[in-house]
């Protein structure tokens, strides 16, 4: 996350890390005891969970193993529509004031909705400084017409956009997969950006998860 | 300072395989930030991107020579190599590696510019 | 495939001058287009990266614009050593990244 802060300790309980051996690969968030939402390029053979801590790394979090994970059939890693990926857990997490699950949206939010993103993604570009507490940022919803002036036809249908016009606060590599919650519902998966992270009225680029909701809630039912 | 060198032999006979090795001096090939990028040129002529491959070994081959290209990475010795069989004339150029840096974060990572170059090892086809 | 069209091939001009090159995407590429410079022998240098981003150590009289299909590389004030040949390479919707024809600089 660059230009965000120090997130309030335990209030992101949902914010999960994907783990390549002990390094970060990838945020995540958690929306059943069994399973956990992230970003479609975030595909990896296997992955470590963290959950329940604030603090990258730290030995007291709960870790467990994912051996499966199911892209959304959609995924193009040419246009990168449905950049959208749960991951099934080995074996079921164990709930707790620092370890809830997200609530999935009923309705997609409008443009002007005040949300928060998070992750322990480089905090400075191009140079990197992987933080080991997690990060945050306000940012506010872009509508569709207002993203397509910067990003033009690489923006997709269900790809949403948040920024703070003439800020640099944005998100960055490590954050993918992470979660955007607005009014308290998880409204987007950090996808994509341009590099250096954090140029001013470059708006971040999240999948829009109000549109896939369908879809995870029978991908997770199909794969109990 | 991060070095690209080509190494290999400059003459290959048709329908044989060309060989080459990129060798990195002052970085690591094992960074996920970045592609490991082939590209050539022919005698006179403008850039042609053969091929690239990332941190995870996978790769991504220009259509035109798909068929005959294979590119590898040996993260203990800190090269990435590329082969290119059944060689003819056309094949005649200059072989550059060289570091491709991400232009985008996430999704986008695979948008990229090539920062570093190796100097160029010419390679000629002929019997 | 996206071709990318370069304008002109060559061109002269005299140390001082300004000169501008274009490079037209056949479809939409966004502002993911980078500039390069090639001395005869020697290895292409990266210019300009997202179409407009200087690179690190490169001169201030160079500078580029455009965004969608069509892009400008500028050069303020032609310099002795900025005699050379100069592509433009657009990096999404690989493979295969693609590059343009090349434009060559020279001394008028």
């Known amino acids: 996350i660059i230009d965000g802060y120090k997130c309030k300790e335990g209030s992101h309980p949902w914010q999960v890390a994907l783990l390549k051996g002990n390094q970060l690969h990838c945020g995540g968030v958690l929306v059943d005891k069994y399973w956990v939402l992230t970003a479609a390029h975030c595909k990896m053979g296997q992955y470590q969970v963290q959950l329940g801590s604030d603090k990258i790394g730290d030995q007291s979090a709960q870790k467990i193993k994912a051996t499966k994970s199911f892209r959304h059939p959609g995924y193009s890693t040419k246009t990168h529509v449905n950049d959208i990926m749960l991951v099934r857990l080995d074996e079921p997490v164990k709930m707790s004031s620092k370890v809830e699950a997200v609530q999935l949206p009923e309705h997609c939010e409008p443009p002007g909705t005040s949300c928060t993103v998070s992750g322990w993604g480089t905090t400075t570009s191009p140079d990197v400084t992987f933080p080991s507490d997690l990060m945050c940022s306000d940012v506010k919803l872009i509508s569709s017409r207002e993203c397509k002036k910067v990003y033009k036809d690489l923006l997709g249908k269900t790809m949403l956009c948040a920024g703070i016009p003439d800020s640099k606060t944005n998100t960055c590599n490590g954050d993918s997969g992470g979660p955007l919650v607005c009014n308290d519902t998880l409204q987007g998966l950090v996808s994509w950006g341009t590099y250096p992270c954090g140029q001013p009225n470059d708006p971040g680029v999240y999948t829009q998860v109000c549109k896939y909701k369908r879809w995870v809630m029978e991908t997770m039912k199909t794969h109990r | 300072q991060l070095q690209l060198q080509e190494s290999g032999p400059g003459l290959v006979k048709p329908s044989e395989t060309l060989s080459l090795t990129c060798t990195v001096s002052g970085g690591s090939i094992s960074s996920d930030d970045y592609y490991w990028v082939w590209i050539r040129q022919p005698p006179g002529k403008g850039l042609e991107w053969i091929g690239s491959i990332d941190y995870f070994a996978s790769t991504y081959y220009n259509p035109s020579l798909k068929s005959r290209v294979t590119i590898s990475v040996d993260t203990s010795k800190n090269q990435f190599s590329l082969k290119l069989s059944s060689v003819t004339a056309a094949d005649t150029a200059v072989y550059y590696c060289?570091?491709?840096?991400?232009?985008?974060?996430?999704?986008?990572?695979?948008?990229?510019?090539?920062?570093?170059w190796g100097q160029g090892t010419t390679v000629t086809v002929s019997s | 495939d996206i071709q990318m069209t370069q304008s002109p091939s060559s061109l002269s001009a005299s140390v001082g001058d300004r000169v501008t090159i274009t490079c037209r995407a056949s479809q939409s590429i966004s502002s993911y287009l980078n500039w390069y410079q090639q001395k005869p022998g020697k290895a292409p240098k990266l210019l300009i990266y997202?179409?407009?981003s200087l690179q690190s150590g490169v001169p201030s009289r160079f500078s580029g614009s455009g965004s969608g299909t069509d892009f400008t590389l500028t050069i303020s004030s032609l310099q002795p050593e900025d005699f050379a040949t100069y592509y433009c390479q657009q990096s999404p919707y690989f493979p295969p990244l693609t590059f343009g024809g090349g434009t060559k600089v020279e001394i008028k």
């Open positions: 997202s179409a407009s």
């Open positions: 060289a570091r491709g840096r991400p232009l985008g974060y996430g999704a986008r990572h695979d948008y990229y510019g090539m920062d570093v």
